[in-house]
């Protein structure tokens, strides 16, 4: 009870009371002080006496405490994908007897749902409500409608508002659990077929066979096949066990293999399912190619006269394939060029860069030439090698080595002499000239003798036919 101070300037004080008068009530000095949070109702009993007649005993005074914030309570809920649920008690509750009775009690949507809408049962369904009355909630006219998207959760935030007494609730968040529904069919997005070697086993790549589904994982997308017309489908790790189903996840992991046998062109019919929806009538084509084998014939040895040019020929280098490939498509690449000369093309500038590629057709035409470059030191026989790589996709490459023998022993139309030098001699009429090593040099005959032992040897020229217009 409020009691005035003894002195005029002393502030009033609050004292607990055991009794009070009607006058104290009339002057507003009897107060109820709420002291227990979360306890919204209270009561006390009185004995009322006026001095006239018998007193009234046990008069019960009930108190309803109005909380500072409207006690709005929320319960999380679940809804099927694309489904709806009425927002009514106990999902949404304002506790206590007072606030729900207020005519002006309304609910504001502070944060609307992201994947759905709050709608009035009979109202326009275009967009979500921004506010609605408590009476609508009690009449079960407000519902949450999910938009059918592939989302697992949604949420929205409401706040209660009592306009006539300027009270609000704290913002209350609702969490919606969306129960997924398999409502989307699988879609075959890629079906390019498979190309492989005859008799081989190869993975069916995900790039060749792929499907998608908005609401199913790759492990739930199942391909079910009928008998393949040119082989069998097996899983990696179990090549002896033929399977009639596999998943997109297995394709993605490279686990699905096709083992070819029989005709070159074939495949298998299949249906695609996500467990709920089936897409039938598809065909996966498997085309096998015969293995193309390259072979190399010919001596693979080129004999060249010293310092001369010699064309490569079919006797030397002759490539062919099991598929009868056009010689223009049989390509040689020079992996390691000659050390004692150079390789060039007859139709191209002979001073140009070293030849890197040529075809079997160019060999047949005699257009690929080897030119031997004379070294400063005499020799009798020298050996050179060319390392080549023969290719003709899709066949496997074949490595080849072309041996080059440069020898004075061979009969050379371009060089009649077997000697290192035999240039002949220019002699003025009636005079003499010295035959020097620059004109006649047979030291190449000793080239096979090791240098230290060469002094022990000499070359002897025996004249078998003397000059008829002069003398030595």
């Amino acid at each position: 009870m409020v009691s005035r101070g003894a002195l005029a300037d002393e502030p009033p004080s609050l004292d607990p009371v055991q009794s009070f008068s009607q006058e104290a009530v009339d002057t507003g000095r009897v107060l109820y002080l709420h002291s227990r949070p979360e306890a919204w109702s209270d009561a006390f009993s009185l004995d009322v006496a006026s001095g006239l007649g018998a007193p009234l005993e046990g008069v019960l005074v009930e108190l309803e405490v109005l909380p500072a914030a409207i006690p709005l309570e929320a319960q999380n809920f679940s809804v099927p994908e694309g489904g709806s649920l009425t927002l009514a008690p106990p999902l949404l509750r304002v506790s206590g007897p007072y606030f729900p009775t207020l005519l002006g009690l309304s609910l504001q949507v502070l944060e609307p749902p992201q994947h759905g809408a709050l709608q009035k049962e009979d109202g326009p369904q275009a967009r979500t409500l921004s506010a609605f009355s408590w009476r609508m909630v009690e009449e079960q006219l407000i519902r949450y409608v999910h938009d059918g998207s592939e989302t697992l959760t949604d949420s929205f935030v409401l706040m209660a508002n009592a306009s006539e007494m300027d009270r609000q609730s704290h913002p209350v968040a609702f969490t919606v659990t969306v129960l997924p529904v398999n409502d989307q069919p699988p879609i075959l997005t890629t079906n390019t077929g498979l190309q492989m070697w005859e008799g081989a086993t190869a993975p069916i790549p995900a790039e060749a066979l792929r499907s998608t589904d908005g609401d199913s994982g790759s492990e739930d997308l199942v391909y079910t096949i009928e008998q393949p017309s040119n082989g069998r489908v097996v899983l990696r790790g179990a090549p002896g066990t033929e399977v009639r189903s596999f998943t997109q996840a297995q394709l993605d992991g490279g686990l699905v293999l096709f083992s070819h046998r029989g005709t070159l062109d074939g495949g298998f019919r299949f249906r695609l399912s996500d467990g709920e929806h089936t897409s039938p009538g598809h065909f996966f084509r498997v085309t096998a190619q015969k293995q193309v084998l390259l072979s190399l014939k010919g001596s693979q040895t080129l004999t060249v006269c010293p310092g001369s040019v010699q064309p490569l020929s079919s006797q030397t280098l002759r490539a062919s394939s099991s598929a009868g490939t056009d010689p223009q498509l049989l390509l040689y690449r020079v992996v390691r060029g000659p050390q004692l000369g150079r390789l060039f093309h007859a139709q191209q500038d002979s001073t140009g860069e070293a030849l890197v590629n040529f075809t079997q057709a160019e060999v047949y035409a005699g257009n690929i030439l080897y030119e031997h470059e004379m070294p400063p030191e005499p020799f009798w026989e020298a050996h050179d090698t060319l390392e080549l790589q023969l290719s003709s996709p899709p066949a496997r490459d074949v490595a080849a080595t072309l041996a080059v023998a440069v020898s004075f022993e061979a009969a050379c139309p371009q060089r009649p002499s077997h000697l290192w030098k035999n240039k002949g001699l220019w002699v003025p009429e009636g005079q003499r000239a010295r035959i020097t090593v620059a004109a006649l040099d047979a030291s190449n005959l000793l080239a096979s003798v090791p240098s230290p032992q060469r002094s022990e040897h000499d070359v002897l020229f025996q004249v078998t036919q003397f000059p008829s217009r002069g003398q030595l």
Epitope: V222, V243, R244, S245
Partner: antibody, heavy 113, light 107 residues
């Protein structure tokens, strides 16, 4: 309509060989696999093996590897089941079926001395 | 090899009852499961293919369900002519295998 017609009943002695046929009609023969099943009185169905009608490649269940041979004659649209070195326990009814849908009427084989 | 276990092995029911026959695989078979009915001295008859696909000409009281390893054949309001042995067959991987069968008796 689709039909699988099997050859008639067989009475054989132990050690002999039998060849049962299954002739298909009403569909593209090489589109669907052909299977053989053994049904013994008082026992269930046992899958014996199948043949890929496009490639001619047979596959057998472990219990039927060795004496059993599945073959086909594409031009005659016929699949065969040959059992060599017959035993008493081979006495049964043998069914052919195409993929999983269509079944032959069954061929009863009795092996008895 | 994939093993198929059928249960129960024998089932005795009165006409009009609804029955459920179970078939369990030893590993996932991706719905490659087919149900057959066999009567004495007759060829098996396909009732359901791929776990749940119905077959034309088969009464609608026969329905199938299941995925992965567990499959069920339901017969709604059983009729006397439904008596026989019911087999499941897995066609997922070789060797294909049958279940041991469920004998359905009508009282």
């Amino acid at each position: 309509q689709i039909q699988l017609v099997q050859s008639g009943p067989e009475l054989k002695k132990p050690g002999e060989t039998v060849k049962i046929s299954c002739k298909a009609s009403g569909y593209t023969f090489t589109d669907y696999s052909m299977h053989w099943v053994k049904k013994t009185p008082g026992k269930g169905l046992k899958w014996l093996g199948w043949i890929n009608t496009a490639t001619g490649e047979p596959t057998y269940a472990d219990d039927f590897k060795g004496r059993f041979a599945i073959s086909l004659e594409t031009s005659a649209r016929t699949v065969y089941l040959q059992i060599n070195n017959l035993r008493n326990e081979d006495t049964a009814t043998y069914f052919c079926f195409s993929y999983y849908d269509y079944w032959g009427q069954g061929t009863t084989l009795t092996v008895s001395a | 090899d994939i093993k198929l276990s059928q249960s129960p092995s024998i089932l005795s029911v009165t006409p009009g009852e609804t029955v459920s026959l179970s078939c369990r695989a030893s590993q996932t078979i991706y719905k490659n499961l087919h149900w057959y009915q066999q009567k004495s001295h007759r060829s098996p008859r396909l009732l359901i293919k791929y776990g749940s696909d119905s077959i034309s000409g088969i009464p609608s009281r026969f329905t199938g369900s299941g995925s992965g390893t567990d499959y069920t054949l339901n017969i709604n309001s059983v009729k006397p002519e439904d008596e026989g042995i019911y087999y499941c067959l897995q066609g997922y991987s070789t060797p294909w295998t049958f279940g041991g069968g469920t004998k359905l008796e009508i009282k």
